[in-house]
Structures are given as C-alpha cells and as structure tokens.
Amino acid sequence: LPAQVAFTPYAPEPGGTCRLREYYDQTAQMCCSKCPPGQHAKVFCTKTSDTVCDSCEDSTYTQLWNWVPECLSCGSRCSSDQVETQACTREQNRICTCRPGWYCALSKQEGCRLCAQLRKCRPGFGVARPGTETSDVVCKPCAPGTFSNTTSSTDICRPHQICHVVAIPGNASMDAVCTSTSPTRSMAPGAVHLPQPVSTRSQHTQPTPAPSTAPGTSFLLPVGPSPPAEGSTGD
C-alpha cells in the first residue's frame, strides 16, 4: 500500500525532514507550508492550522519560497546615471546597471552603490586599458610616432602617417602633415576604437527589511568629485 500523504501541518518522522517547500516550525514542532515568491507569512502555523500567506506590500518582494514575516524592501529607484534593467516586483528586487559610458566606482556586496563616468583621455593621450563595468579607463601618453587628437574614452594612440615629404611633423596630439604626394601608414588608416564596455553584471540593490519592520535608506551615497588622472578630462 502506498504511504499516506501527509497534509501540512504534520509532525515529521523522528529524525526525518520536512518536504520541499515546507519548513519545520520550532514553536509548533510541525512541518508547515512555506509561502511562494511574492508572498510572506502573515500568520505562522500552529499544531492545527497551516501557515497563512499574504502578498508582498507595495515596493517589497520575496524571491524564494519563504516563511518571513515581512517581505524585503526593494532598493531605491535607479539614479540618473543608471538604467533599470529589472523592475521591482513582488517576486524580484529592482536591478540597476550603469549607463553606457559609466562604470561601477563603488561596489558593494551585491552590485553597485555608485556609478561614475568613464575617464576621457585628452589629446596627446590614448587609452592604455579600456574601461570595464567595474574599472575606469587608464590613459597613457602617446609614444613617439603615435598621436591622439581626440578627447575620448575609447580612442587609442594611432601611428603618424608616413610622408614622402613631411610638411609638418606629427606630435603626440597631432598627425603628421604631408606635402601633396600621397602618404602611407605603418598601420591601417583611420581611428582605432575600443568597444564600450557592456554592463551585464547585475547590480542589485541591497535587500533590506520592509519599512514596517526596519526602514531602509537610500543607497546612493554622495561622493565628491575626484581629481582627474593624468591625461584625462573631467567632462
């Protein structure tokens, strides 16, 4: 004969465990139902009655099967330098990622606390290391024979064109100017662009208890301007 199916709440076998989507309630000493994502435990189970679940209140969520008394508070609205890639719903926290051209300057346990604009290398300097979702651009002076005449977070130093007859010699921020005979280059012509970093890493706001238990606070911290690194601009 098949074993009788137990309905929650029920006392587990000695040394046994509760089934999937159930939890052991220490007070009732029974296996009780968990609440599904998007809900929380409104009333805990007793020996004779199962958990009573209720929907998460506005701007709160639970992502997992749970028996928490309050849903977690969604993180603050995304700031102007961020993009909301996942909305706050009853089942998921808001996710903010840095906009293109920005990187995560101040990370935290889950995601990013503060985005900052990628450094732009000024003329005479090129990108030595491109920005990523978590690191800034590194600029370097253009070596002899190369130049950059742009203010850019993606352009590297390019080789001067090679002239049969030089009208104006090139320098770190200007290409060589040739006389009318056609020039050649030591590399393929045209600006070399590094791709913008694509922000893919989830930047979850830190889950905090919903306001009825412990109010959360805004996670965007004011950060003063930092001096631009050598070869970069602050714009």
């Epitope: 929907s55 701007s59 508070s73 805004s218």
Partner: antibody, heavy 120, light 108 residues
Framework: EVQLQESGPEIVKPGASVKLSCTAS????????MHWVKQRPEQGLEWIGR????????KHDPKFQDKATLSSDTSSNTAYLQFSSLTSEDTAVYYC?????????????WGQGTTVTVSS | DIQMTQSPAIMSASLGERVTMTCTAS???????LHWYQQKPGSSPKLWIY???NLPSGVPARFSGSGSGTSYSLTISSMEAEDAATYYC?????????FGGGTKLEIK
C-alpha cells in the same frame, strides 16, 4: 499619453450614496495601484484608500472603512469609489491617483478631480 | 497612524529668495517612502519630489529635497513666481498613508 479621466460633478442629498469612476489610459504597467484622495474646500489632502486592480485587494484609512467601497473593472481600466451615507462633511473634491508598484507609493498621475456636493 | 506636520502653514517669499519648508513625522519614515506634491488653486496635485530628494522630469532644478527619519524639508534655491502654490508632504511608510497639512507659499 497617460491620463486618468474622472466622472463628472455630483450633487447628492444627505444619506444618499454616490459612485465615482476613474478611467485610466496610456498605462503599460499592469503592476499599479489606484488611490483615492479627498480634499474638502480650502483644506488639505486626505488619503481614503487604494485598490490593486489586478487582484482587487483594497486598503483603506480606517476612518473611511465603513464609508468608502473601492472596486475596479480591469476590462475597462476603470476604478470606482462608492461613498455611502453622505453628510455635509463629505462635500469635497475626490481625486484618483496612480502609483506604480515599486515606486514607494509616489502618486505620479492624478485625475482632474470630481466635485461632490452634499446638499438637501 | 503617522502624523505629518508641515511648517510653516503659510509663508511668503520674495522673487529670488531661498525658501525652505519642513515636514515632521510623528514616527520614523524611510526616506524612500517620503514624497512631496505641489498643488495650485483649481488644479490637481502634482508629484513634485519623490523618495525625499528625486525630481520627476519637468520639475525645475531649483527645487531640492532632503531629510531622514522624522525630519524632511523641501528647498527652493531661488523663488520664482510660478512656485507660488501649496506643497504637501506624504508618507507611504505605514498604512494608513498620510499627507501633511500643507505649506502655502505666496509671493511677497
């Protein structure tokens, strides 16, 4: 364009009931709340209650619990406020307002208001 | 219920003047759940500042909001004629959600 269109002005007798409507258009977010707010002449704003149109769940200020009934019709994107046992204290402008789930209750769109006058 | 007290109830300011009005909650309110609305006579309220310090699009940058816990404020860096209105604070921290009594801002 997002709009909340409320029903027209009402003149009702004391003790009667009135049902106000608020029709939403231009919204693409299903996770919203519709709130009702009361403003008596030359007075401030009072929150009456709100409804989650997707589930029909409502929440009231306890002082309006026996006076106000909130309902909605998802097929017409319309929220309703029924006020019963009207007295002169209920003479006011009633606004509907929308807040998206996850925006911490910020009411970002408001109807034009419905004036209710209770007079014998 | 959380009571929201706004002060002053009425104030007047000259054009170009810096204006600050305050909103005090009877118990702590999370900054995400504190909003301000502007209302002009004969018009519906408009969301003016959300989550303590954020401006919806269309609200001039001369407006700012700050605060935490039980004390919040709305500031206009330089008063303009179109700012004359009544401003209400609103808490959504704990139901029943409540509005302050309003601060009526007039031009001096």
């Amino acid at each position: 364009e997002v709009q909340l269109q409320e029903s027209g002005p009402e003149i009702v007798k004391p003790g009667a009931s009135v049902k106000l409507s608020c029709t939403a258009s231009g919204f693409n977010n299903k996770d919203i709340y519709m709130h009702w707010v009361k403003q008596r002449p030359e007075q401030g704003l009072e929150w009456i209650g709100r409804i989650d149109p997707a589930t029909g769940n409502t929440k009231h200020d306890p002082k309006f619990q026996d006076k106000a009934t909130l309902s909605s019709d998802t097929s017409s994107n319309t929220a309703y406020l029924q006020f019963s046992s009207l007295t002169s204290e209920d003479t006011a402008v009633y606004y509907c307002a929308h807040s998206p789930y996850g925006d911490f209750g910020a009411m970002d769109y408001w109807g034009q208001g419905t004036t209710v006058t209770v007079s014998s | 219920d959380i009571q929201m007290t706004q002060s002053p109830a009425i104030m007047s300011a000259s054009l170009g003047e810096r204006v600050t009005m305050t909103c005090t909650a009877s118990s702590s309110v999370s900054s995400n759940y504190l909003h301000w609305y502007q209302q002009k006579p004969g018009s519906s309220p408009k969301l003016w500042i959300y989550s303590t310090s954020n401006l919806p699009s269309g609200v001039p940058a001369r407006f700012s909001g700050s605060g935490s816990g039980t004390s919040y404020s709305l500031t206009i860096s330089s008063m303009e004629a179109e700012d004359a209105a009544t401003y209400y604070c609103h808490q959504y921290h704990r139901s029943p959600w409540t509005f302050g009594g309003g601060t009526k801002l007039e031009i001096k």
